[in-house]
Amino acid sequence: QPQGLSGMQGEPSLGDSSSGEDELGVDVLPSEEDAPEEADPPDGEDPPEVNSEDRMEESLGLEDLSTPEAPEHSQGSHGDEKGGGHSHWSYGGTLLWPQVSPACAGRFQSPVDIRLERTAFCRTLQPLELLGYELQPLPELSLSNNGHTVQLTLPPGLKMALGPGQEYRALQLHLHWGTSDHPGSEHTVNGHRFPAEIHVVHLSTAFSELHEALGRPGGLAVLAAFLQESPEENSAYEQLLSHLEEISEEGSKIEIPGLDVSALLPSDLSRYYRYEGSLTTPPCSQGVIWTVFNETVKLSAKQLHTLSVSLWGPRDSRLQLNFRATQPLNGRTIEASFPAAEDSSPEPVHVNSCFTAGD
């Protein structure tokens, strides 16, 4: 390793927290603007996947569905390779992802649409515990544009527990977004797509390296939160967004001061949705434990605009609409740590359906 330098995997080091959040209650969901993808069949099974190739999904109003527009114009087609092998992928070629990685055609994929009335209240889902997320300005962190998203690489020491004996360490965080006109969250709630979404990716402490955990149940855990517009600027996010111009070019990477990672998440870590899914990009490995917070994080319109226009991706195209279409549940139950269903009773339903990471 480079001498005198330390970090994860022998990594060499390169020489006010909450801005207000909203609950995802049904009342905040537009009734006309965002129609759910499909009406579910009577038997409760999921409809066939509607790919982003075919239409702009929920992010367009019903009147727009007759003239479909796929969220793929920011990225070229899959086949434009510059090297050997067949591993290049784009958001404009999601139908080809299974050719890149067969797991992308798996039955338990992410993201998903969270239908509130179908969630199962699970009393055993306790508030998440985060430890060591309040980073100091030094050491600095790597912020990069990898052509698919903006990524902040996190240092060792950020620990998270999904529950007793389910400990993880944070590896990195990244964002998904749309354009100025179209929202770009990956998960949706009752068919509603939010402007953007943050993912904090964690590795189970049962594994020393990521490749060992890929595809293993509970090997990876992702904390996800929706970003929503508000009048106020989010000072925590500004510490990221203010650097985007410096990494506008695909592949660029800079060092920025450490920040309070917990301030990028909602303040209420007790109300969330939980299901088992996959990575949302190739190789789409399954067994990922997803935690989607009920509270949204607020950013100003200017900040959301900055996120959607600052970065460039493959083939000199804007890095936008970097979200995957919602995937069928295929019988999975989305659990909630609180009574999220509209008709929920005081007593928890499906309490025995609660699963543990790694089950």
Epitope: Q9, H88, W89, N146, Q151, L171, E209, P314
Partner: nanobody
Framework: QVQLVESGGGLVQPGGSLRLSCSAS???????????MHWYRQAPGKGLELVAV???????YYADSVKGRFTISRDNSKKTLYLQMNSLRAEDTAVYYC????????WGQGTQVTVSS
């Protein structure tokens, strides 16, 4: 065991060329194709410097100090990263490290490049 192994370093005269390779073995082979791959270097007594990047989509990025002289490329079928270095200068003398960035960083042990007459 994840391994990134650099090779191709050596002693070369100013103006000369070298081609570095970085081969992935073990678990690194599974993530290579999806990783953004980097070349870094560390000159004696200096900090680590990013030299070049190639994303999983094939996009490339170079430090200003090497633009027009160095070319990064990858062969995903061979799980190998390359750095073609032309018009080498004395200030290019350093240990060169290969890095795979896929959710977490994987590093090679480095290969020494010395540019001297």
């Amino acid at each position: 065991q994840v391994q990134l192994v650099e090779s191709g370093g050596g002693l070369v005269q100013p103006g000369g060329s070298l081609r570095l390779s970085c081969s992935a073995s073990g678990g690194a082979r599974n993530i290579f194709s999806f990783a953004a791959m980097h070349w870094y270097r560390q000159a004696p007594g200096k900090g680590l410097e990013l030299v070049a990047v190639i994303t999983s989509a094939g996009g490339t990025y170079y430090a200003d100090s090497v633009k027009g002289r160095f070319t990064i490329s990858r062969d995903n079928s061979k799980k190998t990263l390359y750095l073609q270095m032309n018009s080498l200068r004395a200030e290019d003398t350093a240990v060169y490290y290969c890095n795979a960035d896929y959710y977490q960083d994987y590093w090679g042990q480095g290969t020494q490049v010395t540019v001297s007459s």
